[in-house]
């Protein structure tokens, strides 16, 4: 039950995280004009990964796309790439994790297959989250560098008579959305990996052999050892005591470890 909950929660957290990464990637407010020197500006500038916008106090907003690839800074291209890779990995991870969910039955999919898929999606979510966090952090670092550079050259004037104020940019809302979303995706991925441990079957399901003793019938099931994945705890042989004898075909599959967690 707890494994199912962990897996489900991991999936939901990752889903929210990936939705956030997509939202952050599409948002225009990656960097916003620093209003420290002029808090009552009539023109407010902000920039995204794909376009830059200007909002006038009149209410008019004008956005212009970056219609060049070669003319864009390499760092911006790198951030775009990281965010897109994060989205793609996250989307694939979501697709895989849907089939891996314990609450969803697809044919006669083995628990081991579901465990592997859960692990795969978990790793994908972790990498996706790391890509988003890295992308946002690279952009933030770029902003900090430019901020201090523009502060150093804040005013350039002609004989001190005419002031040309350089527009400085600071962290936009998208950065915080990206950091939070990346973190959630990462947490979701970790949860999926934890759930994988519990999903992995503890023993190989051999057919049970019935031993007909003279007194009362006891059905034994030998405990098989799981392949060493590093996720299982020490397995123990389990006995099921039954009131009457059962044939081979009547022997039911035994509860897995995760049902007792």
């Amino acid at each position: 039950m707890a494994v199912t909950a962990c897996q489900g929660l991991g999936f939901v957290v990752s889903l929210i995280g990936i939705a956030g990464i997509i939202a952050a990637t599409c948002m225009d407010q990656w960097s916003t004009q620093d209003l420290y020197n002029n808090p009552v500006t009539a023109v407010f500038n902000y920039q995204g990964l794909w376009r830059s916008c200007v909002r006038e106090s009149s209410g008019f907003t004008e956005c212009r796309g970056y219609f060049t690839l070669l003319g864009l800074p390499a760092m911006l291209q790198a951030v775009r790439a990281l965010m897109i890779v994060g989205i793609v990995l996250g989307a694939i991870g979501l697709l895989v994790s849907i089939f891996a969910l314990k609450c969803i039955r697809i044919g006669s999919m083995e628990d081991s297959a579901k465990a592997n898929m859960t692990l795969t999606s978990g790793i994908m979510f972790i990498v996706s989250g790391l890509c988003a966090i890295a992308g946002v952090s690279v952009f933030a670092n770029m902003l900090v560098t430019n901020f201090w550079m523009s502060t150093a050259n804040m005013y350039t004037g002609m004989g001190g008579m005419v002031q040309t104020v350089q527009t400085r940019y600071t962290f936009g809302a998208a950065l915080f959305v990206g950091w939070v979303a990346g973190g959630l995706t990462l947490i979701g991925g970790v949860m999926m990996c934890i759930a994988c441990r519990g999903l992995a079957p503890e023993e190989t399901n051999y057919k049970a052999v019935s031993y007909h003793a003279s007194g009362h019938s006891v059905a034994y099931k030998p405990g098989g050892f799981k392949a060493s994945t590093g996720f299982g705890s020490n397995t123990k042989n389990k006995k099921i005591y039954d009131g009457g004898a059962r044939t081979e075909d009547e022997v039911q599959s035994y509860p897995s470890k995760h049902d007792y967690v």
């Epitope: 500006t41 009539a42 023109v43 106090s57 209410g59 040309t164 104020v165």
Partner: antibody, heavy 118, light 113 residues
Framework: DVQLVESGGGLVQPGGSRKLSCAAS????????MHWIRQTPEKGLEWVAY????????YYADTVKGRFTISRDNPKNTLFLQMTSLRSEDTAMYFC???????????WGQGTLVTVSA | DIVMTQSPSFLTVTAGEKVTMSCKSS????????????LTWYQQKPGQPPKLLIY???TRESGVPDRFTGSGSGTDFTLTVSSVQAEDLALYYC?????????FGAGTKLELK
């Protein structure tokens, strides 16, 4: 057709109060920022106050800050300017204007004259 | 505050003549975000409110005759009337539309010889 009609002007004693109104028609009033601008032969055109379409933010000229209050009633398509502690230098023709592209004023009212005198 | 300086204060012209008036700002009105200059020109005739002529330094308002042209960038701007008509005789104001407080120039009065 866009129309802005100011009212409420007149003779006021120094230290007195006055409330100006601007009735708007011919456009979606709630969708535009609005301004009060005044004009005197000595000072020319002087921007007084601004109120955004949703009533926030609001900005004032330093000369009127703390004495004048701009407000709007979107359902009634009306802009207001409450003036208190009036001084002789507040004597002017007061215009209301609509904010437009490029932070320009595309439509102005005919103005209402406020005279502050003993 | 951005100070707007207009020159000359008076311009005496004859009908059909080309005329230019200047407006200088104490601070650049060029916005780096969209490369637009936030300067506006108005025309005011006696007993009337100002009328918008040009915004973004060079964009003509609809209905404004094409003999009116705005130009310039940064801190230096010009309004040109290619062929002055009798109805163009008025006061012309430039306005800082870049930051609050929105400030106006003292105006240039266009008069007939």
């Amino acid at each position: 057709d866009v129309q802005l009609v100011e009212s409420g002007g007149g003779l006021v004693q120094p230290g007195g109060s006055r409330k100006l109104s601007c009735a708007a028609s011919g456009f979606t009033f709630s969708g535009f920022g609005m301004h009060w601008i005044r004009q005197t032969p000595e000072k020319g055109l002087e921007w007084v106050a601004y109120i955004s379409s949703g009533s926030r933010p609001i900005y004032y000229a330093d000369t009127v800050k703390g004495r004048f209050t701009i407000s709007r009633d979107n359902p009634k398509n009306t802009l207001f300017l409450q003036m208190t502690s009036l001084r002789s230098e507040d004597t002017a023709m007061y215009f209301c204007a609509r904010f437009y592209y490029g932070n320009s004023f595309d439509h102005w009212g005919q103005g209402t004259l406020v005279t502050v005198s003993a | 505050d951005i100070v707007m300086t207009q020159s000359p204060s008076f311009l005496t012209v004859t009908a059909g003549e080309k005329v230019t008036m200047s407006c200088k700002s104490s601070q650049s009105l060029l916005n780096s975000g969209n490369q637009r200059n936030y300067l506006t020109w108005y025309q005011q005739k006696p007993g009337q409110p100002p009328k918008l002529l040009i915004y973004w330094a060079s964009t003509r308002e609809s209905g404004v005759p094409d003999r009116f042209t705005g130009s310039g960038s940064g801190t230096d701007f010009t309004l040109t009337v290619s062929s002055v008509q009798a109805e163009d005789l008025a006061l012309y104001y430039c306005q800082n539309a870049y930051s609050f407080p929105l400030t106006f120039g003292a105006g240039t009065k266009l008069e007939l010889k």
